[in-house]
Interface confidence: low
């Protein structure tokens, strides 16, 4: 029974809930190009960190079966059919795999090798290759290679008349919602409808804030446990029900969205999951839901 678990076990189990490993699924058809998104936000333009892509889940260190590697400034290793199609200098290290076959199915590791002990960001992305559909009439492919990066760039105020959404200044949760409304009828929305792509918004937040929220969640859970125990109304409270509390503000956002991995704290948000041609949604979802592919992200300073 949950109420009789030692306090240390409760904390440990809560911590495990907060640090679930992420594995998101992506699909492509044989013969198409597969697109596996991976991003980070350089501390300053050009201040890049090494990144490796490997076939297989992320090991403790480095990448296994490396297919592409960057250093602080350069792509220093790549193999045929694997390349970076995006704006590498601005932190878009998304991997494109050309002309995929069934053998390309599996887990891929994107490892962002942030300086410091055990600071690496690790992303496991599951690629599922489906046999090519045989259709008599030509249909527009859902080519993520083409579709996804289009969301990244708007004409704007960059040094060469280009602005990347990933570098918009001072964006916050309220502005994300506003942005969603402003873009609903825009050309970008039309692109989204055409491509079926999604935009991932990842917001980097100070570790202190996250720690505070995590503590608040733990305190809330303990108070809830105490309340339940004292009222003797709930004899069995499982971790499953704890993890699936209905959406109720920040506590749920922390439970569902914060991933504490090594020393990096991230809230992942999913904006514009395109369900139907003219329906656009802006909502928070946990990165652990494999049915919802991740797209691009904004970064808070």
């Amino acid at each position: 029974m949950f109420s009789h678990l030692p306090f240390d076990c409760v904390l440990l189990l809560l911590l495990l809930l907060l640090t679930r490993s992420s594995e998101v699924e992506y699909r492509a058809e044989v013969g198409q190009n597969a697109y596996l998104p991976c991003f980070y936000t350089p501390a300053a333009p050009g201040n890049l960190v090494p990144v490796c892509w490997g076939k297989g889940a992320c090991p403790v260190f480095e990448c296994g079966n490396v297919v592409l590697r960057t250093d602080e400034r350069d792509v220093n290793y790549w193999t045929s059919r694997y390349w970076l199609n995006g704006d590498f200098r601005k932190g878009d290290v998304s991997l494109t795999i050309e002309n995929v076959t069934l053998a390309d199915s599996g887990i891929y590791c994107c490892r962002i090798q942030i300086p410091g002990i055990m600071n690496d960001e690790k992303f496991n992305l599951k690629l599922v290759i489906k046999p090519a559909k045989v259709t008599p009439a030509p249909t527009r492919q859902r080519d993520f290679t083409a579709a996804f990066p289009r969301m990244l760039t708007t004409r704007g105020h960059g040094p060469a008349e280009t602005q990347t959404l990933g570098s918009l200044p001072d964006i916050n949760l309220t502005q994300i919602s506003t942005l969603a409304n402003e873009l609903r009828d825009s050309r970008l929305a039309n692109d989204l409808r055409d491509s079926g792509a999604t935009i991932r918004i990842g917001i980097y937040i100070g570790a202190g804030i996250c720690a505070g929220l995590a503590l608040a969640l733990i305190f809330g859970a303990l108070i809830f446990k105490w309340y339940s125990h004292s009222k003797e109304k709930i004899q069995n409270l499982s971790l499953i029900s704890l993890a699936n509390l209905p959406p109720s503000g920040l506590a749920n956002a922390v439970a569902e969205g914060i991933r504490s991995e090594e020393n990096i704290y991230t809230i992942e948000e999913n904006v514009y999951e395109v369900e139907e041609p003219n329906e656009y949604y802006c909502y928070v979802s946990s990165r652990q839901q494999p049915s919802q592919p991740l797209g691009c992200r904004f970064a808070m300073p």
Partner: antibody
Framework: EVKLLESGGGLVQPGGSLKLSCAAS????????MSWVRQAPGKGLEWIGE????????NYTPSLKDKFIISRDNAKNTLFLQMSKVRSEDTALYYC???????????????WGQGTSVTVSS | DIVLTQSPASLAVSLGQRATISCRAS??????????MHWYQQKPGQPPKLLIY???NLESGIPARFSGSGSRTDFTLTINPVEADDVATYYC?????????FGGGTKLEIK
């Protein structure tokens, strides 16, 4: 063998428009950033702009942004430069160029076409 | 924009001697210790040809007589020894920041 062949140059009147093409062969065009560079007679090189593999990012030198449009057709392995509102100072040899790595736009340009000449005169 | 200033504008060197061309950037073209400065050679009637990339890396097929050095804002192209075939105009170019920019060029002649 990598080949870049520019075409579409010629004589154009001030204020007029012209569309230059660059036909690429010998490499997977759809994987490369591509650039346009121009050179006025007896002058140095001037970078016009670049386009990424799927046309989602196009960077221009600011002074030319309102006059020139860079585009590409990966199915036809062709890069384009649409020139408008041309003036005499746009008279130049126009080169298309390709960087040395196919996934990253910050590299030096290791392949160049022979250029196509544009003369703006009334 | 990053302005690249090449000097000298023209240079006459005897065969077998050393030629040194300088390129100064108005701001650093370095990031994480790597310099995004490149050198090109252009002969009359021909397109530019890449000689050196990222300050000091010799492009494939280019003779070892050509070398590059420098970091941040000051860069040098050295040709040693100069041969008759080296008569051309040499340009530096930075790709650290859009818009990419070229230097004004240095014309190398033989004494």
């Amino acid at each position: 063998e990598v080949k870049l062949l520019e075409s579409g140059g010629g004589l154009v009147q001030p204020g007029g428009s012209l569309k230059l093409s660059c036909a690429a062969s010998g490499f997977d065009f759809s994987r490369y950033w591509m650039s346009w560079v121009r050179q006025a007679p007896g002058k140095g090189l001037e970078w016009i702009g670049e386009i990424n593999p799927d046309s989602s990012t196009i960077n221009y030198t600011p002074s030319l942004k309102d006059k020139f449009i860079i585009s590409r057709d990966n199915a036809k392995n062709t890069l384009f430069l649409q020139m408008s509102k041309v003036r005499s100072e746009d008279t130049a040899l126009y080169y298309c160029a390709r960087p040395s790595y196919d996934g990253y736009y910050g590299y030096a340009m290791d392949y160049w076409g022979q250029g196509t000449s544009v003369t703006v005169s009334s | 924009d990053i302005v690249l200033t090449q000097s000298p504008a023209s240079l006459a060197v005897s065969l077998g001697q050393r030629a040194t061309i300088s390129c100064r950037a108005s701001e650093s073209v370095d990031s994480y210790g790597k310099s995004f400065m490149h050198w090109y050679q252009q002969k009359p009637g021909q397109p530019p040809k890449l000689l050196i990339y990222r300050a000091s890396n010799l492009e494939s097929g280019i003779p070892a007589r050509f070398s590059g050095s420098g970091s941040r804002t000051d860069f040098t192209l050295t040709i040693n020894p100069v041969e008759a075939d080296d008569v051309a105009t040499y340009y530096c170019q930075q790709s650290n920041e859009d818009p990419y920019t070229f230097g004004g060029g240095t014309k190398l002649e033989i004494k």
